[in-house]
């Protein structure tokens, strides 16, 4: 029978660490991490890490009992967890019978949004207490709410990942810019900033009809030339406060009729908060 892995949590040092070993298995040949999505009962989905590793093809894998994988996550707070993946059989060949290196994977470490992860792996038995053992590590940065997969997560949807404000902005005259955008039921308070290297104007927008999606309009006084300036619209939603996803547009000249026309270069950009 071919070896497979059985993985379970192991937070402390492996028991083998306390034992003296004449020889230890060789190091891993490769370690990779990629995100995978899994459905959860709430109708949402979670993102998990698919950690895969390749064993070196030589006789040292005959000593191999397990591979331990530890993940440290750094975002607003630090997390640390480890799993130990035991091999179910002793290795009878250095490569798979069908050809290629022995490759295994573990899917289970949860992925939070916009977090840097450090993934380390080493074979067991590992090095003796005062020795450096072979190990491999990789970094993995999880995407934020603007990612094509992440944006459908409930947390991201509540932060406005699917909201398209369709911003239009035009220069009415030397002193004012008219900004129009589509509101969202996610919140009723917005901040519109006009920037041309520096902030040349801003306005708070309060939209009382929060439950309806309407088109809001605000005229903003400016203190400099506004043509070509950037409009930044910052929403304030309950889930993300002042760190919600921000949207951008560009100020153009108003048509003679005074009606601003839509732009096709609307851009979204994360604020400080990429949940």
């Amino acid at each position: 029978r071919e070896p497979t892995v059985q993985c379970g949590s192991e937070t402390g040092p492996s028991p083998e660490w306390m034992l003296q070993h004449d020889l230890i298995p060789g190091d891993l040949r490769d370690l990779r991490v990629e995100p995978v999505t899994t459905s959860v009962a709430t109708g949402d989905y979670s993102i998990l890490m698919n950690v895969s590793w390749v064993l070196r093809a030589d006789a040292s894998i005959r000593l191999l009992k397990a591979t331990k994988i530890c993940v440290t996550g750094k975002s607003n707070f630090q997390s640390y967890s480890c799993v130990r993946c035991n091999y179910t059989e002793a290795f009878q060949t250095q490569t798979r019978p069908s050809g290629g290196k022995w490759t295994f994977s573990y899917i289970g470490f949860p992925v939070e949004l916009n977090t840097v992860y450090f993934i380390g792996a080493h074979n067991i038995p590992n090095a003796n207490m005062n020795e450096d053992g072979p190990s491999m590590s990789v970094n993995f940065t999880s995407p934020g709410c603007l990612d094509h997969i992440m944006k459908y997560k409930k947390k991201c949807v509540k932060a406005g990942s699917l909201w398209d404000p369709n911003i239009t902005a035009c220069k009415k005259n030397e002193e004012t810019v008219e900004v129009n955008f589509t509101t969202t039921p996610l919140g009723n308070r917005y901040m519109a900033l006009i920037q041309h290297s520096t902030i040349i104007g801003f306005s708070q927008v309060f939209e009382p009809h929060q439950k309806k999606q309407t088109r809001a309009s605000v005229v903003i006084p400016v203190t400099g030339d506004s043509e070509g300036a950037t409009v930044q619209l910052t929403p304030y939603f309950p889930t993300c406060g002042s760190d919600c996803i921000r949207h951008k547009g560009t100020v153009v000249l108003c048509p003679q009729t005074g009606v601003p026309f839509p732009l096709d270069n609307n851009k979204s950009k994360p604020g400080g908060w990429l949940p």
Epitope: Q94, R96, P97, G99
Partner: antibody
Amino acid sequence: EVQLVQSGAEVKKPGASVKVSCKTSGYTFISYWMNWVRQAPGQGLEWIGRIDPYDSEIQYNQKFKDKAILTVDTSISTAYMELSRLRSDDTAVYYCARSGGFDWFAYWGQGTLVTVSS
Amino acid sequence: DIQMTQSPSSLSASVGDRVTITCRTSENIYSNLAWYQQKPGKAPKLLLYDATNLGDGVPSRFSGSGSGTDYTLTISSLQPEDFATYYCQHFWGPPYTFGGGTKVEIK
């Protein structure tokens, strides 16, 4: 029946290169590493290196790192070893040898004599 | 690299004799050892692997023993076709090395 058939003897001048082939049959080529071993006249055996036909990973004996280049053509189940900058002390019989479950050499080619002489 | 010391380098024996060849490694190779027989002008032939397992078609008069750093090839009753050179090889991990060889000659 597993067979490894090597190309014929070669006579080369110093500084030249030679490419030795090892045509295999009777097993799944990509499932086993292929090793190359050298035996100088009247001498013992020296391991040159090995290649995994599955993904062309190569591991060399440091001594031969700048001397030998190992390749495979999986479409015709053939391994190759090219020796460059030949010198008279490269005169030897060169063997291809297929690994077993681990790197014992279960099957050997008949050997290719490479003679380097001016 | 792991060093392989094979002894003796040559020996003379008669048909029917019991012959023992030893191989010492510079470090523990956990029985990852093979023995080969080579006749003049021919490729080596696998006799034993994993120190004790017989290769395909190898007569049972050949046997292997040992562990750690000391290994032995024994021919229980030497036959005329056994006059050849014998090599040990470790396959613990690259680079693989061979012993210097033992030439078994007719006394």
